[in-house]
Interface confidence: medium
């Protein structure tokens, strides 16, 4: 389905509003340091050009690819070399190498100031004064901080952001209306960004076979009544959508996502009974709803898997005919029967099944060899079950903050070379698994917990890839996508690590501690905890607890003092000395 002008095709399909939003997101994700005004100027130029192509598809340059058009536009930025250094060298390349070069320079941890939320009245005034600019600013700020954010989904977030302001800026108590909505959008946005980052890592580091396997397992759990043929079609289409978005082809991605939503809604009967309420919604909401839809009920009469995958005389014949199709069918059949398993566990089972067939189909008596293959699954299933059980018990015993601290200690001992901010961020997020998953019924705990942990550990892998410091982390991150979490779980105290020299400056605190929010105070304390473990990796739980309790008491005392700074100056050195003695 070729078009004379790709840019005109996408403009007509998407409409001006979505076209402009997506181009702004694309440019902001590539040039993360550029000022807002610069991006708006570039987007307006591209939009005007697109309109000329809509009017006449044969007009000059309208036949160029989107990569060529967008890349040429990005390369007109005057300060490219000063701001981005070697990224400017991308502009000397031809497509498709130029786009690949831009992709490689996307920065998962850009050096940008944290977003500060202004007063509600200030935000409402800005919203009313120029709604379009206000919403563009939101797209720009989120996209540049999250260069892999799922672009069509970001348009949905922007629509919700707009709706929140439209409603709350009219309310009697603007803050009470708006702030919870903004908090929810922020938290959901961070989660959405992290989930999409794992999809892109899966595609980019492990290939589309890995992504397709993940998608077969997840969609089979969601749509257990759908046939394998239907699931396969959805997987193929979904892979195309995510490949495009992860590759920076945001217009194509959004267009194809809309087509997929249309297809699903037109074929609900052969997919799932749960799609109905999604399909009545407008496009952005509909696509979001379909992506988040709950699992359909499992068909009542599913036969045992053993007949087709263990007992049948045709197992090796079918496997040899088309390995990936046969394994895909196995994964589909297993996943639709097990909504209680994590996707990662299902993929491990498929890998184990594949390894058994590879070995047994070359044996003298294949059937005898693979007859007990399902017994080999038991330890693979029990490992995450036990892990979830133990960690949920610990979470219920400690509460979220102390559970995070336990994980901080655990992970710092495993990989002490990793930077302290990364260990704090990752361990805090690992710790959130408790509140997110442990309250769920037993059948939903493992898929919630392990698949969430996979997303968080991917963040560790992505940050570590930028500045590699630990061979253990590199090994766990690169050897196997499905075994990342078990690989990290299996790491022990790093005996080769040379403890970090004690630095009193790291443990020096000031009165500004008292004005911090509860979350910021926790981060300060957790940063100190990581540094303590790096200094004394063999410190016991009791020793660390004693030091942290003393720290909390010292901060509380000084924050109640009349002269807070004087108290910190006097009590700080005492706390440091006492801590060193306690850990000696």
């Amino acid at each position: 389905d070729t078009h004379k002008s790709e840019v005109a095709h996408r403009f007509k399909d998407l409409g001006e509003e979505h076209f402009k939003g997506l181009v702004l997101v694309a440019f902001s994700q590539y040039l993360q340091q550029c000022p807002f005004e610069e991006h708006v100027k570039l987007v307006n130029e591209v939009t005007e050009f697109a309109k000329t192509c809509v009017a006449d598809e044969s007009a000059e340059n309208c036949d160029k690819s989107l990569h060529t058009l967008f890349g040429d536009k990005l390369c007109t930025v005057a300060t490219l070399r000063e701001t981005y250094g070697e990224m400017a060298d991308c502009c000397a390349k031809q497509e498709p190498e130029r786009n690949e070069c831009f992709l490689q320079h996307k920065d998962d941890n850009p050096n940008l100031p944290p977003l500060v939320r202004p007063e509600v009245d200030v935000m409402c005034t800005a919203f009313h004064d120029n709604e379009a600019t206000f919403l563009k600013k939101y797209l720009y700020e989120v996209a540049r901080r999250h260069p892999y954010f799922y672009a069509p989904e970001l348009l949905f977030f922007a629509a919700r952001y707009k709706a929140a302001f439209a409603e709350c800026c009219q309310a009697a108590d603007k803050a009470a209306c708006l702030l919870p909505k903004l908090d929810e959008l922020r938290d959901e946005g961070k989660a959405s960004s992290a989930k999409q980052r794992l999809k892109c890592a899966s595609l980019q580091k492990f290939g589309d076979r890995a992504f397709k396997a993940w998608a077969v397992a997840r969609l089979s759990q969601k749509f257990p009544k759908a046939e394998f043929a239907e699931v396969s079609k959805l997987v193929t289409d979904l892979t195309k959508v995510h490949t495009e978005c992860c590759h920076g082809d945001l217009l194509e991605c959004a267009d194809d996502r809309a087509d997929l939503a249309k297809y699903m809604c037109e074929n609900q009967d052969s997919i799932s009974s749960k799609l109905k309420e999604c399909c009545d919604k407008p496009l952005l909401e509909k696509s979001h709803c379909l992506a988040e839809v709950e699992n359909d009920e499992m068909p009542a009469d599913l036969p045992s898997l053993a007949a087709d995958y263990v007992e049948s005389k045709d197992v090796c014949k079918n496997y040899a005919e088309a390995k990936d199709v046969f394994l895909g069918m196995f994964l589909y059949e297993y996943a639709r029967r097990h909504p209680d398993y994590s996707v990662m566990l299902l993929l491990r089972l498929a890998k184990a099944y594949e390894a058994t067939l590879e070995k047994c189909c070359a044996a003298a008596d294949p059937h005898e060899c693979y007859a007990k293959v399902f017994d080999e699954f038991q330890p693979l299933v029990e490992e995450p079950q036990n892990l979830v059980k133990q960690n949920c018990e610990l979470f219920e015993q400690l509460g979220e903050y102390k559970f995070q601290n336990a994980l901080l200690v655990r992970y710092t001992k495993k990989v002490p070379q990793v930077s302290t901010p990364t260990l704090v961020e990752v361990s805090r997020n690992l710790g959130k698994v408790g509140a997110k998953c442990c309250k769920l019924p037993e059948a939903k705990r493992m898929p919630c917990a392990e698949d969430y942990l996979s997303v968080v550990l991917n963040r560790l892998c992505v940050l570590h890839e930028k500045t590699p410091v630990s061979e253990k982390v590199t090994k766990c991150c690169t050897e196997s996508l499905v075994n990342r979490r078990p690989c990290f779980s299996a790491l022990e105290l790093d005996e080769a690590y040379v403890p970090k020299a004690f630095n009193a400056e790291t443990f020096t605190f000031h009165a500004d501690m008292c004005t911090l929010s509860e979350k910021e105070k926790q981060v300060k304390k957790q940063t100190a905890l990581v540094e303590l473990v790096k200094h004394k990796p063999k410190a016991t739980k009791e020793q660390l607890k004693g030091v942290m309790d003393n720290f909390a008491a010292f901060v509380e005392k000084c924050c109640k003092a009349d002269d807070k700074e004087a108290c910190f100056a006097e009590e700080g050195p005492k706390f440091v000395a006492a801590s060193q003695a306690a850990l000696a």
Epitope: E227, A229, S270, A322, V325
Partner: nanobody
Framework: EVQLLESGGGLVQPGGSLRLSCAAS????????VAWFRQAPGKGREFVAG????????YYADSVKGRFTISRDNSKNTLYLQMNSLRPEDTAVYYC???????????????????WGQGTLVTVSS
């Protein structure tokens, strides 16, 4: 346009065997997902067995597993169904259907097959 022509039906005693054939023209049979369905009087069309396009991955209804075998001969552009240990409940008109849009994958839903033969009657009775 795809044409399908079934043959090989007839009357057979319980426990007996039959081999049905489905000759295709207008498209190579190995490029499409093909399947055998059957329809007993007063009932809907029921999936019996299928074979993927391009690869010989076979699918069977639980009721016929171990008794029926689907295969094809690409040189003759023909699909077969070998039926052993026939039972009275196997009595039906047997149809072959083809689904060119999705190689590798057969479906158990009759509506997804755009092309059908006219059917061949199989009667299992003593």
């Amino acid at each position: 346009e795809v044409q399908l022509l079934e043959s090989g039906g007839g009357l057979v005693q319980p426990g007996g065997s039959l081999r049905l054939s489905c000759a295709a023209s207008g498209r190579y049979i190995d490029e499409t997902a093909v399947a055998w369905f059957r329809q007993a009087p007063g009932k809907g069309r029921e999936f019996v067995a299928g074979i993927g396009g391009g690869v010989d991955i076979t699918y069977y209804a639980d009721s016929v597993k171990g008794r029926f075998t689907i295969s094809r001969d690409n040189s003759k552009n023909t699909l077969y169904l070998q039926m052993n240990s026939l039972r009275p409940e196997d009595t039906a008109v047997y149809y072959c259907g083809t689904r060119p849009g999705r190689p590798l994958i057969t479906s158990k839903v009759a509506d997804l097959y755009p092309y059908w033969g006219q059917g061949t009657l199989v009667t299992v009775s003593s």
